[in-house]
């Protein structure tokens, strides 16, 4: 079951999936001046069996100006730099991607890929949040959102990460940070 909406946006933070549930689709988008090859896939699909998951189909882009199709090759380093949405890796990575059964890893870039990836998530997908540069987390509480099915509708749980800038922190007294370690699990709302 596909999630109806995108994961929630919160102030001064970005989100990233660390692994993708089977059924997730990734649009085959090309950067400006390029287009999908004729008869090329519209999307990649995370599929698999109980022991292994992988991405079906391959995305291929060709120059809009030429009639020739291009083969898919390993992207050049400068092309990889353009990618925005998959650069947010490790410090926030809570699990080894490979260790999650029923999930695919981040697909490798393809030549002339668009700068942003458009995923279509499925129920049960979890995304993780971290503060953007110049902001820090207020405390070490849960920083994820999960796509859930409730009352026959899909919705994402609200991430509880609060990101604050330096000035804001110094202007706001009343901060108390106990020693107790917080729960790090996403909330599970009871369905009706």
């Amino acid at each position: 079951e596909l999630c109806d909406d995108d994961p929630p946006e919160i102030p001064h933070a970005t989100f990233k999936a660390m692994a993708y549930k089977e059924g997730t689709m990734l649009n085959c988008e090309c950067k400006r001046g390029f287009r999908r090859i004729k008869s090329g896939s519209l999307y990649m699909l995370c599929t698999g069996n109980s022991s292994h998951s992988s991405w079906d189909n391959q995305c291929q882009c060709t120059s809009s100006a030429t009639r020739n199709t291009t083969k898919q090759v390993t992207p050049q380093p400068e092309e990889q730099k353009e990618r925005k949405t998959t650069e947010m890796q490790s410090p926030m990575q809570p699990v080894d991607q490979a260790s999650l059964p029923g999930h695919c890893r981040e697909p490798p870039p393809w030549e002339n890929e668009a700068t942003e990836r458009i995923y279509h998530f499925v129920v049960g997908q979890m995304v993780y949040y971290q503060c953007v540069q110049g902001y820090r987390a207020l405390h070490r509480g849960p920083a994820e959102s999960v796509c859930k099915m409730t009352h026959g509708k899909t919705r994402w749980t609200q991430p509880q990460l609060i990101c604050t800038g330096e000035m804001e922190t110094s202007q706001f007294p009343g901060e108390e940070k106990p020693q107790a370690s917080p729960e790090g699990r996403p909330e599970s709302e009871t369905s009706c």
Epitope: I10, P11, R140, G141, E168, F172, P178, P182, E187, T190
Partner: antibody
Framework: EVQLVQSGAEVKKPGESLKISCKGS????????IGWVRQMPGKGLEWMGI????????KYSPSFQGQVTFSADKSTSTAYLQWSSLQASDTAMYYC?????????WGQGTLVTVSS | DIQMTQSPSTLSASVGDRVTITCRAS??????LAWYQQKPGKAPKLLIY???SLESGVPSRFSGSGSGTEFTLTISSLQPDDFATYYC?????????FGGGTKLEIK
């Protein structure tokens, strides 16, 4: 169904202490910030601050710093707002809310009246 | 603190009217704005978040727009149930702040 249920109305004298409660149900209480909002008679809404029930991290609005104390008991899914010495100006309706950004669930409110 | 200023403070209108309430922030808050409806003796109810996203279960006659410092709440065709007080609230900063409220009354 997500619910925040607050304790009943209170009538107190100036100088007395008070602790009101907000019990959450229908969701994982520990994993959501709980905020408090004051509404004085005939007036607008004022943000008092928030508490994370998971680890009791608190943030107070400057106007309420030192005037009130937030606490939470995750074992009973209950958040508390307390005063050590009430004043007549504390007379208001107090709402607990689920945060920390837009406030999607509200308690029914606890009316606190402070009068000699 | 980020100050939120609502206008008008009182608005008289009739059933079927299209009404607009404005909220201004003292500094840019991107789209981090919510709108609430409050009826006498009741807790406020979330209508709109992220400036224009309609909360589940809220009638489609309510809509929000704006970004930066200027925001509006529009009710396309007033219903008898809509006469209430409306508040905006910013959440760009974790020190949340509310507008002063707009009382929508029957003309």
């Amino acid at each position: 169904e997500v619910q925040l249920v607050q304790s009943g109305a209170e009538v107190k004298k100036p100088g007395e202490s008070l602790k009101i409660s907000c019990k959450g149900s229908g969701y994982s209480f520990s994993n959501y910030w709980i905020g408090w909002v004051r509404q004085m008679p005939g007036k607008g809404l004022e943000w008092m601050g928030i508490i994370s029930p998971g680890d009791s991290t608190t943030k107070y609005s400057p106007s309420f710093q030192g005037q009130v104390t937030f606490s939470a008991d995750k074992s009973t899914s209950t958040a508390y707002l307390q005063w050590s010495s009430l004043q007549a100006s504390d007379t208001a309706m107090y709402y607990c809310v689920r945060g920390p950004y837009y406030l999607d669930y509200w308690g029914q409110g606890t009316l606190v009246t402070v009068s000699s | 603190d980020i100050q939120m200023t609502q206008s008008p403070s009182t608005l008289s209108a009739s059933v079927g009217d299209r009404v607009t309430i404005t909220c201004r922030a003292s500094q840019s808050i991107s789209s981090w704005l919510a709108w609430y409806q409050q009826k006498p003796g009741k807790a406020p109810k979330l209508l709109i978040y992220k400036a224009s996203s309609l909360e589940s279960g809220v009638p489609s006659r309510f809509s929000g727009s704006g970004s930066g410092t200027e925001f509006t709440l529009t009710i396309s065709s007033l219903q008898p149930d809509d006469f209430a007080t409306y508040y905006c609230q910013q959440y760009n900063s974790y020190l949340l702040t509310f507008g002063g409220g707009t009382k929508l009354e029957i003309k």
